[in-house]
Amino acid sequence: QEDEDGDYEELVLALRSEEDGLAEAPEHGTTATFHRCAKDPWRLPGTYVVVLKEETHLSQSERTARRLQAQAARRGYLTKILHVFHGLLPGFLVKMSGDLLELALKLPHVDYIEEDSSVFAQSIPWNLERITPPRYRADEYQPPDGGSLVEVYLLDTSIQSDHREIEGRVMVTDFENVPEEDGTRFHRQASKCDSHGTHLAGVVSGRDAGVAKGASMRSLRVLNCQGKGTVSGTLIGLEFIRKSQLVQPVGPLVVLLPLAGGYSRVLNAACQRLARAGVVLVTAAGNFRDDACLYSPASAPEVITVGATNAQDQPVTLGTLGTNFGRCVDLFAPGEDIIGASSDCSTCFVSQSGTSQAAAHVAGIAAMMLSAEPELTLAELRQRLIHFSAKDVINEAWFPEDQRVLTPNLVAALPPSTHGAGWQLFCRTVWSAHSGPTRMATAVARCAPDEELLSCSSFSRSGKRRGERMEAQGGKLVCRAHNAFGGEGVYAIARCCLLPQANCSVHTAPPAEASMGTRVHCHQQGHVLTGCSSHWEVEDLGTHKPPVLRPRGQPNQCVGHREASIHASCCHAPGLECKVKEHGIPAPQEQVTVACEEGWTLTGCSALPGTSHVLGAYAVDNTCVVRSRDVSTTGSTSEGAVTAVAICCRSRHLAQASQELQ
């Protein structure tokens, strides 16, 4: 979801002088960095998370913390080590003066330091409840019982665990890490303190209004009575979950994070580590009517990030704000006027709204899916959530224009049957961060560790781009898009699929000399074409149109502009078969689409020809979309003809395997 250079404020303090008494100086040329929340009112100066390099042991963390204290004391500063992290991230939490940051950044093993910041419950009005009658009546939806094999961890406020709706379903752990409430006259009223968490526990597993009625829950208190917490408190909570998981391994775990703060490198890193330990994390996209990539943990790619929609499948408006949106959102879910347990009394119900409620729905759906198929990986679960979602029902006009193409038009739904989806070839579309406008700017889109990158495309609103290519990075293929001179920037779009036992490679043909255009095909035995990309060095491709229809008997071929290098993604996997589907429109059109038919999955989406009036191509569910410049501005009809090229695949192997199971 977010690129390494995500949107947050970074202050790099260079190592200006050799620190006295430093036995182990940092490696030559490395500079530890300092990060802080870009939203000033949310900053908590004076408390810092010192993150150490990945391989640092607990003893080294403790030694580094002691060294900081000793060196600070020599300068007349008091420091307090509040917590030493281990299990998820190596490091420590320290209370100290900001004057000591430069000193701290020079310590051995230090990777980066992040100033602590606030996180907030994502329900509105989360403590100004509109009490409904003690019970809502009659014909309400009754989802099936489920989720009994799954444990859901809730990081939230305190909760009223003996509420009739959730009694016996929630184990309140002894974990508590919350800041003091704001204001000297704040009165802690238990029912208000428990409001947010109680409601969400009810949405996940409540007997009446819960999604996964069979799921058991464990609650950790990281938000105070005002619904406010800290990044550091959330980190310590995530570490607590990891340690619990190690001490007593149970079945599948879902962690619900119905909170949001500003972009936090350390919170995202902790979520990544926990996800890679096999835990499913679900979080609120945020209620700021803003790009979710600017918030954490919403911006963590490994987390399932959920936006909120209402009963009419429209994005939720919350006062002057509303649900967050953008490429960091995985899907939307109901988040307006959601009925759930109210902490006002042991049998009361209330409606609350927000992306917290939406995330709770998805956590419940995830619990049901994992209960039915406990071996599902995070990647498999995410793909299923996307696959079973209601498609194209959200009115995108609510989102800012530049975010519409990036925001998934998906509303979460329970699968019609929790079994029997195994035969499907699942794919999803992953957008990169925007490259920025500089001439050589690039954008990179990545798939999850256990997904295969089957194709790569690019998109630029100005049309000024130099295409895209798949390249190896850290032993894995990534999709890189290239900006062009005068361009406002590009996006890379990866098509990420679940393809067990796949062996994929990229075949490249350099720009052709002949006027026929460039071609490349999958020549290895048993390899099939899953995607085509083209990349060019020239600033503006001419209007040359290659023949868009492939010669008969050569479906495994990518065709492109003669001045472009063409890249074919070729994969071998048991039972994998693919076909090329094209839709050409002779007259100029702003959008051309081609869809794969039932039973086939879109793996590749590209445009022919790759001329400069084509803004790019991208996959939306099972449809390949090619966008062109507004023809009224190009004025030319000769180069108006555009063809959308879809590559549609299916796996006979997956289908057979699923039939054998049934």
Epitope: P134, R137, D162, R164, E167, G168, S346, T347
Partner: antibody
């Protein structure tokens, strides 16, 4: 295993008070409240009220008309039900049960109100 | 308050018989219904919760069904130890209320 152990039988005069205790063990007491149910001789079950171990919140049946008080002591995992101004029709077996769902019951405490 | 009406109030049956007890709520209670068995001098024992879920340790001959206002407890093959009084209870709303009981006696 889950257990609810109640105090012993009581014989009271009309107008007196009785306080029955119920000690819970084998589970996290704050995850459930305690329901109190009584059964007059040869009669059916009558719910009296519910009390929270977590916050001490209560729900009372209207019929108690302020004569009953339910409390908890989380430190000892014990719930109490006090009934004042006893009448002869309060003669019954008093049960404590776990939560609203009443999935586990105490053995019962016989309260006899007789002059 | 929600009224719970059980029928019959008593029945005589033989070992091996299939026995059905019904419970009607005065208003919709979704599936918030429990069934209890009580033997003389003993505390009630939960058999069925959520209208149809069997409590752990309860023999499979006991089953529950229904939703909304009409519910049924079925004993598929009556055993000697099943002669007792059976109560339904709604906990959809406070006050939680019980049916008046059905006494199952030996024919």
């Amino acid at each position: 295993q889950v257990q609810l152990v109640q105090s012993g039988a009581e014989v009271k005069k009309p107008g007196a008070s009785v306080k029955v205790s119920c000690k819970a063990s084998g589970y996290t007491v704050t995850s459930y409240g305690i329901s109190w149910v009584r059964q007059a001789p040869g009669q059916g079950l009558e719910w009296m009220g519910w009390v929270s171990f977590y916050q001490g919140n209560t729900n009372y049946a209207q019929k108690l008309q302020g004569r009953g008080t339910m409390t908890t002591d989380p430190s000892t995992s014990t719930a109490y039900m006090e009934l004042r101004s006893l009448r002869s029709d309060d003669t019954a077996v008093y049960y404590c049960a776990r939560g609203f769902g009443m999935d586990r019951w105490g053995q019962g405490t016989t309260v006899t109100v007789s002059s | 308050d929600i009224q719970m009406t059980q029928s019959p109030s008593s029945l005589s049956a033989s070992v091996g018989d299939r026995v059905t007890i019904t419970c009607r709520a005065s208003q919709n209670i979704n599936s918030w219904l429990n069934w209890y068995q009580q033997k003389p001098g003993k505390a009630p024992k939960l058999l069925i919760y959520g209208a149809s879920s069997r409590q752990s340790g309860v023999p499979s001959r006991f089953s529950g069904s229904g939703s909304g206002t009409d519910f049924t407890l079925t004993i598929s093959s009556l055993q000697p130890e099943d002669f007792a009084t059976y109560y339904c209870q709604q906990w959809f709303d406070v006050p939680t209320t019980f049916g008046q009981g059905t006494k199952v006696e030996i024919k």
